[in-house]
């Protein structure tokens, strides 16, 4: 049985040309997690594997760096950036977990951090 | 260099037993998942088994549940295929492929030819 | 189960030629779409990883494109050595699937 929940960074924004971390937070559960993809919509960006490190989808090297932990660090933010992200966290024995964060880069520099909040 | 050699193959009557081999050299073989994908003669790729990495966690192709089981020796740098009441449709060159991230198949085995017939 | 859809299943074409193949998922897959090569008595040999990126040592006329359910693998100019089978894979989620292939022959 599923019992972890994911809390992510939630509904955020930055200013274009700037960056921003994604993060999410398994909690609850006790499952050994083996891996975390990031996905941008139909994207892969990155991988973390418990074995074999990060792997950075080579069309995004430039512009994403492993971590902080498990996260993701978005850089030099366009406004294309704009969009859902997931964070898919594989484990063991429980499954899948599947965090979403909506980003939207703004053209201002007025760009505020949404709340935290879970999902179950 | 990586490497991939299976072994084991041959000529087995319906109903009877086989273990594929696959030794891998080159990397380390513990970190990453591993597959097995068949061939029959003249038609396309089919996946059989896959094993991860950490949790040795296996999954398989519903033709072959139930009587395949896939595992794996991080010590001996093997792989494995335990065949049983294999059927003539399972006649087949049959590969082992390394899988990191359990995404892509990046190296693969020469392959080792079953032939189950009476 | 997830079905890949490729086609065409054979072309025939020319030294030089722009090359496409596609191939459909069932369902959506995001990126989880990969593409070998395999020539006769050979083992598959891994072209694109996760829709669009080269795998290394892969020529860089290979290219990949797609996301969801519909992805394409160009030659942009075929060489003599591409004459193959090529097949797409996904691995979304188990039972891992490949499509049917497309074999480009010699026009």
């Known amino acids: 049985m599923m019992t972890g929940t994911i809390e992510t960074t939630g509904n955020i924004s930055a200013e274009k040309g700037g960056s921003i971390i994604l993060q999410c937070h398994l909690s609850s559960t006790t499952a050994q997690v083996t891996q975390v993809n990031w996905e941008q919509q139909d994207q892969l960006l990155a991988i973390c594997n418990a074995d074999l490190g990060w792997h950075i989808s080579p069309s995004f090297k430039d512009r994403v760096a492993p971590g902080p932990g498990l996260g993701l660090t978005l850089q030099s933010l366009t406004v294309n950036d704009t969009g859902e992200y997931f964070c898919i966290y594989h484990t063991y024995p429980d499954g899948t977990y599947t965090g979403r964060i909506f980003l939207e880069v703004l053209e201002s520099s007025v760009a505020e951090h949404g709340a935290r909040f879970q999902i179950p | 260099e990586v490497q991939l050699l299976e072994s084991g193959g041959g000529l087995v009557q319906p109903g009877g037993s086989l273990r594929l081999s696959c030794a891998a050299s080159g990397f380390t073989f513990s970190s990453y998942a591993m597959s097995w994908v068949r061939q029959a003669p003249g038609k396309g790729l089919e996946w059989v088994a896959s094993?991860?990495?950490?949790?040795?966690?296996?999954y398989y192709a519903d033709s072959v549940k139930g009587r395949f089981t896939i595992s794996r020796d991080n010590s001996k740098n093997t792989l494995y295929l335990q065949m049983n009441s294999l059927r003539a449709e399972d006649t087949a060159v049959y590969y082992c492929?390394?899988?990191?991230?359990?995404?892509?198949?990046?190296?693969w085995g020469q392959g080792t030819l079953v032939t189950v017939s009476s | 189960d997830i079905q890949m859809t490729q086609s065409p299943s054979s072309l025939s074409a020319s030294v030089g030629d722009r090359v496409t193949i596609t191939c459909r998922a069932s369902?959506?897959?995001?990126?989880?779409l990969n593409w070998y090569q395999q020539k006769p008595g050979k083992a598959p040999k891994l072209l694109i990883y996760a829709a669009s990126s080269l795998q290394s040592g892969v020529p860089s006329r290979f290219s990949g494109s797609g996301s969801g359910t519909d992805f394409t693998l160009t030659i942009s100019s075929l060489q003599p050595e591409d004459f193959a089978t090529y097949y797409c894979?996904?691995?979304?989620?188990?039972?891992?699937?490949f499509g049917g292939g497309t074999k480009v022959e010699i026009k």
């Open positions: 894979q996904q691995s979304y989620s188990t039972p891992l699937t």
């Open positions: 492929a390394r899988e990191p991230y359990s995404v892509w198949m990046d190296y």
């Open positions: 094993i991860k990495s950490s949790t040795s966690s296996t």
């Open positions: 369902q959506s897959i995001s990126s989880y």
